[in-house]
Amino acid sequence: HTAAQDNCTCPTNKMTVCSPDGPGGRCQCRALGSGMAVDCSTLTSKCLLLKARMSAPKNARTLVRPSEHALVDNDGLYDPDCDPEGRFKARQCNQTSVCWCVNSVGVRRTDKGDLSLRCDELVRTHHILIDLRHRPTAGAFNHSDLDAELRRLFRERYRLHPKFVAAVHYEQPTIQIELRQNTSQKAAGDVDIGDAAYYFERDIKGESLFQGRGGLDLRVRGEPLQVERTLIYYLDEIPPKFSMKRLTA
């Protein structure tokens, strides 16, 4: 089963409308908001998920210091324009004709401008740093157990190829997961690190995008791993272009 033919639902995306109107009466699911057909055997792209969301009723130190070019998603939610493949269009504009350029995870990477703003290409986010703080536990998690469980989580729940999980750092109570995926490394059918990170972020916030209503159940050697805060940094293949005014503000 992929799109759960028996009851025609999309296991990997609850923000869909499904009906048995595909070829041969097969279950076909379409994303809310865009109406685009989605592949329920893998993750739905972040752009389509954001669009659907907007359419819905309302020892040695091992931790990584994010680069000066790292982006944090401070703008939050917006109704994005997606291309026919479900990826973010390089230029995004709002209803008041304010436009900006985004990277492949939909995070703004330029100052805001008007309709004359040009975004020549969609710049790829090739490095994502997920910074987590876990709730107090009786003792620290064993680093190798934690590493193995998080890698397995990304492989099995988010279907991200293990080679794209570059590292798991742990310095109690901070956990950092590094995802890396260059354009040249990403083959057809590979889950995008941006999509995996978005599903993970929503899971951690208790807002699972999967069809099941239970939500994420993550444990390390039987001990629940409960996260109390998340920060995600995005690094692009080409550094972002912000004016000095913003950088000194």
């Epitope: 009851n7 729940r157 239970g214 994420l216």
Partner: nanobody, 131 residues
Framework: QVQLQESGGGSVQAGGSLRLSCAAS????????MAWFRQTLGKEREGVAI????????RYADSVKGRFTISRDGTKNTMSLQMNSLEPADTAMYYC????????????????????????WGQGTQVTVSS
């Protein structure tokens, strides 16, 4: 693709015991919620017992509480259902099922939408309890 295979069914007298087993083909079932369901002719499949991926949380249908025990062995990718004090009302085809998504918290056994969470099924094993 997750494939499940049940075994251990058979015929038994009321008050007797049986142990059903379920073998999973896929390594990733080790991190999926799993369950046993049963179905009698002309009736809807009903949840019998459910177990989380760590094997630490189990839930049972009221009709089998205190008589049936669900367990799993993550290292062998197997799950079992120990059925004691069997009654004629337990006669049914028994199916093991695996959740759609790994690392998903198990739904409640009485959730009317429970079948949505379990797209992977075995072929079933028949249990017949005679009085």
């Amino acid at each position: 693709q997750v494939q499940l295979q049940e075994s251990g069914g058979g015929s038994v007298q009321a008050g007797g015991s049986l142990r059903l087993s379920c073998a999973a083909s896929d390594y990733s079932t080790g991190r999926r919620c799993m369950a046993w369901f049963r179905q009698t002719l002309g009736k809807e499949r009903e949840g019998v017992a459910i177990i989380d991926y760590a094997g630490t949380s189990t839930r049972y249908a009221d009709s089998v509480k205190g008589r049936f025990t669900i367990s799993r062995d993550g290292t062998k990718n197997t799950m079992s259902l120990q059925m004691n004090s069997l009654e004629p009302a337990d006669t049914a085809m028994y199916y093991c099922a695996a959740a759609a998504i790994p690392y998903e918290r198990c739904p409640d056994i009485s959730d009317p939408q429970i079948l949505v969470s379990f797209p992977y099924w075995g072929q079933g094993t028949q249990v017949t309890v005679s009085s």
